[in-house]
Amino acid sequence: AQYTRPSNVSNIDVSTNTTAATLSWQNFDDASPTYSYCLLIEKAGNSSNATQVVTDIGITDATVTELIPGSSYTVEIFAQVGDGIKSLEPGRKSFCTDPASMASFDCEVVPKEPALVLKWTCPPGANAGFELEVSSGAWNNATHLESCSSENGTEYRTEVTYLNFSTSYNISITTVSCGKMAAPTRNTCTTGITDPPPPDGSPNITSVSHNSVKVKFSGFEASHGPIKAYAVILTTGEAGHPSADVLKYTYEDFKKGASDTYVTYLIRTEEKGRSQSLSEVLKYEIDVGNESTTLGYYNGKLEPLGSYRACVAGFTNITFHPQNKGLIDGAESYVSFSRYSDAVSLPQDVAAAHHHHHH
């Protein structure tokens, strides 16, 4: 049979997902119901590996599968009739498959830094990069991330900095390729903690008796993490700035003369049965010298006529020595210190003085 050459196809339409493209087209020849169509699908930059699809007669659509996500392709469509008589020119169309979403990403806190490290494996296929969105309440930040390669299963990471401590962030990462955006992948991550900010003031110390004092102080600000505990520290020495080293000294050490500074009382804030908001500042009042014991610290009687100063340590993380039961490990804890109070001088023991006078 004799056939005239088919006209070229036109109006090629493409709809895509990550790994397939559905193509449809038109041919306006009266004889088009007798045509089949030959499709050549070529990945950009890889002409040696074209996929060929031939449709059944009269079919003007086809779905091509096993494509690579986020990749650019060109399709050429020839109309053909009889024994391979083809249209002179193919209809041509470039298209991109949709990029693949990131399967998931993990968050890691950065110790003592208001930052998060995000880790992920590259999604399959090609990408031009990623959109990163970080949001917490009214604050948000959008940035671009560089592209990655899925070929070797490498773990990719980025550090998100300039965040707040102990704050929950909504994080979204969107794959981009060929000007297309995948569905965002979301996670909620919370930043870590660090030493609390040292308070501006110092505790208030007042004499109650010849062997006890009252120490009053305000709770530390919780912007670097919730305050887990406070330690009340006394000294009879020079009131320099205390260091974490003093947290190992007890009343017993003080009595033995091993140290002029010691921890006399420990408050675990969780035990107060209420959560402290960032703005809520609690007031504390401690009786020092009442012979109570908190963990490894004995709150022993003070020396009559002694001169004492008080300081408070606040902890966002309190760690105890595994071997010295109940004693704080200052190096492993997240702690900051108030300044020392002014000195208070205890009165003499009136009863003892009276007794001494009679003899």
């Epitope: 031009a128 990069g129 959109e131 969105e133 949001s135 948000n140 930040n141 959008a142 671009h144 909504n170 979204s172 969107t174 981009v176 000007g179 297309k180 955006m181 995948a182 569905a183 965002p184 979301r186």
Partner: antibody
Framework: EVKLVESGGGLVQPGRSLKLSCAAS????????MAWVRQAPTKGLEWVAY????????YYRDSVKGRFTISRDNAKSTLYLQMDSLRSEDAATYYC??????????WGQGTLVTVSS | DIQMTQTPHSLSASLGETVSIECLAS??????LAWYQQKPGKSPQLLIS???PLHDGVPSRFSGSGSGTQFSLKIRNMQPEDEGVYYC?????????FGAGTKLELK
């Protein structure tokens, strides 16, 4: 095929309000960062506002901050720009656009906003 | 704000000629640079994003190069349909900013 169609432009007096819409089709609207870009008559292009896909975070150029509000309705595949306290310098053709990785990829045909008393 | 300085302001080229448009960013923008073509009465069209990848359907006679602060758009084999105004734009940092445009005419 990506299609963006802006509407809502018109003549408005200074100090008054106008709300622009952009109807999107041919792509998964909820996946995309979207933006408004404007072009004053015979002038260049100026980015106006931007909204993300994940949490709908918004960003504005300083001159419109506090007066313009970008929003999106993913169920309707529509982007909006609420423009309040309009000034003569806001007169322009307003385009909506998809904006992956900081590039304005697909554009609508634009809607003209005229601000005059 | 990052300033985008485009040169030249206008140029005319003969059919088949190669033309170059330069764009200078006032600070480093990595490769977050796009080029657009706008014809009278029409919307801008993306030509190139990320400094060099051609957008879908853009003829291969267009090419982009550069990174950091200096970028250029090259049009080889000038065609009548290439007439229009060309804009560069940085998408690195808010506010996203455009160059003032380069008007390209056919001689």
């Amino acid at each position: 095929e990506v299609k963006l169609v802006e509407s809502g432009g018109g003549l408005v007096q200074p100090g008054r309000s106008l709300k622009l819409s952009c109807a999107a089709s041919g792509f998964t609207f909820s996946n995309y960062y979207m933006a408004w870009v404007r072009q004053a008559p015979t002038k260049g292009l100026e980015w106006v506002a931007y909204i993300t896909n994940g949490f709908g975070s918004t960003y504005y150029r300083d001159s419109v901050k506090g007066r313009f509000t970008i929003s999106r309705d993913n169920a309707k595949s529509t982007l909006y720009l609420q423009m309040d306290s309009l000034r003569s310098e806001d007169a322009a053709t307003y385009y909506c656009s998809t904006v992956p990785l900081g590039a304005f990829v697909s554009w609508g045909q634009g809607t003209l906003v005229t601000v005059s008393s | 704000d990052i300033q985008m300085t485009q040169t030249p302001h206008s140029l005319s080229a003969s059919l088949g000629e190669t033309v170059s448009i330069e764009c200078l960013a006032s600070e480093g923008i990595s490769n977050y640079l796009a080029w657009y073509q706008q014809k009278p009465g029409k919307s801008p069209q993306l030509l190139i994003s990320h400094a060099n990848p051609l957008h879908d359907g853009v003829p291969s006679r267009f090419s982009g190069s550069g990174s950091g602060t200096q970028f250029s758009l090259k049009i080889r084999n000038m065609q009548p349909e290439d007439e229009g105004v060309y804009y560069c734009q940085q998408g690195y940092k808010f506010p996203y900013t455009f160059g003032a445009g380069t008007k390209l005419e056919l001689k």
